[in-house]
Amino acid sequence: HHHHHHASQPCPYPMAPPNGHLSPVQAKYILKDSFSIFCEPGYELLQGHLPLKSFAAVCQKDGSWDQPMPSCSIVDCGPPDDLPSGRVEYITGPEVTTYKAVIQYSCEETFYTMKVNDGKYVCEADGFWTSSKGERSPPVCEPVCGLSARTTGGRIYGGQKAKPGDFPWQVLILGGSTAAGALLYDNWVLTAAHAIYEQKHDASSLDIRLGALKRLSPHYTQAWAEAVFIHEGYTHDAGFDNDIALIKLNNKVVINSNITPICLPRKEAESFMRTDDIGTASGWGLTQRGLLARNLMYVDIPIVDHQKCTAAYEKPPYSGGSVTANMLCAGLESGGKDSCRGDAGGALVFLDNETQRWFVGGIVSWGSMNCGEAGQYGVYTKVINYIPWIKNIISNF
């Protein structure tokens, strides 16, 4: 007695899609047989617009496949991300974003420079724009620092009027008393802890102005603080050690000839900050007339030997130990040139002769009761001691 089993109907012979291949290849496919589709490199499995990592179809008892054939479509990396303060150029062809296409990122000339890589990206088989170093995220256009209209570090209190673009990193800080700061990158301000201590829990009350020349001018770029970071080693009303703070701005500022960040000192910077090397302080602080300056002023002053400065501040009314290793002093022994009240937090800058860029060596911190006094000097926070602190905060916030 024989049972006649009807042979199940074979499924239609599958045809691999263009740029794909089928496995396993069989003479015919019957019930429960299956096949998978694999795409060539640079092509991806898609069912319409929906991506698939793998595809397998099974032959059903009615002789039909349980799902339709997918396509192997060329990988499309899509439009590349915009580059703030830069642009992207399609190298392979206009708007071509498919596998092996090449694009070139570049930064706005003069004021921005490319960080991370050379800006050339290729659309890879995984669907991501990728640099030659393997980075998937776009490059960064970092503001060029230390550019100034002032070309010499030659010949405030006893100072001269600044011209547009001379001190483009200069920041005016209002909200408590008048203070200053210096722009770092495009969204940070370096200043003195004592200058903004009262606002440390109320960052939004700080009125921050960039690109200004005249203190009361309506022509400036407004910025607001997102957060204030005061050095944890600074103690208010107990000397000026660690008198350094950072303000994070709530938006990046647009860099131009009147708003440019100051550079942080390189390791080699100390060679440009030896005794008698000239630094430049700028600000709207008290002038010889005893009033806040209307115009941004600057003064070129030499660095003073640390021991000489320490000794100058050991006599009453000062207490011994006022000048620490975290400070540097600048000024003339004869007096007459100094920073003063209202300049606090501003940068004492130096020209790096190798890079021809200006960098911040000091932050206006404290000094004699009478600015520009003979035998007394302006005391500045020694920025090079705080590079790890600055970099740690900027990278973490």
Epitope: Q47, G48, H49, L50, P51, L52, K53, S54, A56, A57, D66, Q67, P68, G78, D126, G127, F128
Partner: antibody, heavy 118, light 105 residues
């Protein structure tokens, strides 16, 4: 069984950002398929917002491209929606869903209602 | 791509055969899915690739069409089928139809 669960604030103020999380259980979001955000407005109109694929690539509805971001955390098997500069027009029920034909099946979360109001 | 479901409402009786239609503004091949949604619930997938039924979906639901014209047919309407039906194209990005509500006569 594959399950998707949306979470996030039910009330957002105009001009702020809307942030939602979709937690997936029963299947790894890196294994396959597209992981989508879809919203349904009052009146039942459905709108696809975008997806993040198994490989981490994204595709967005062109009408939302300037203010949408879909990201993921593979260690938590979650994917996220951020919609910036919301207005009252963004009031809707937001669904996360795994869309895919054949063996892929279709799985949707139960939806979370978001109201944009001051 | 716009998916047009021209009938907002369709009246039917239990046991009837009803066809819900969807028209694409351009060719979408067979990259169309159909969904059923009941009040207070998430959409439930019925059909993918225009004519393939998801497992667990009763065989009274059939899908057909390709290119621009698509139909979901319910051959023997049951009371639990009274719901809103949406089509979805996934050929170029994804767009849903505006929905067709199936109600009792």
């Amino acid at each position: 069984d594959v399950q998707l669960q949306e979470s996030g604030p039910g009330l957002v103020k105009p001009s702020q950002s809307l942030s939602l999380t979709c937690t997936v259980t029963g299947y790894s979001i890196t294994s396959d398929y597209a992981w989508n955000w879809i919203r349904q407005f009052p009146g039942n109109k459905l709108e696809w917002m975008g997806y993040i694929s198994y490989s981490g690539r994204t595709s967005y509805n062109p009408s939302l491209k300037s203010r949408i971001s879909i990201t993921r955390d593979t260690s938590k098997n979650q994917f996220f929606l951020q919609l910036n500069s919301v207005t009252t027009e963004d009031t809707a029920t937001y669904y996360c869903a795994k869309l895919g034909g054949g063996h892929g099946m279709d799985y949707w979360g139960q939806g979370t209602s978001v109201t944009v109001s001051s | 791509i716009v998916m047009t479901q021209s009938q907002k409402f369709m009246s039917t009786s239990v046991g009837d055969r009803v066809s819900v239609t969807c028209k694409a503004s351009q060719n979408v091949d067979t990259n169309v899915a159909w969904y059923q949604q009941k009040p207070g619930q998430s959409p439930k997938a019925l059909i993918y690739s225009a004519s393939y039924r998801y497992s667990g979906v009763p065989d009274r639901f059939t899908g057909s069409g390709s290119g621009t014209d698509f139909t979901l047919t319910i051959s023997n309407v049951q009371s639990e089928d009274l719901a809103e039906y949406f089509c979805l194209q996934y050929n170029s990005y994804l767009t849903f139809g505006s929905g067709t509500k199936l109600e009792l006569k």
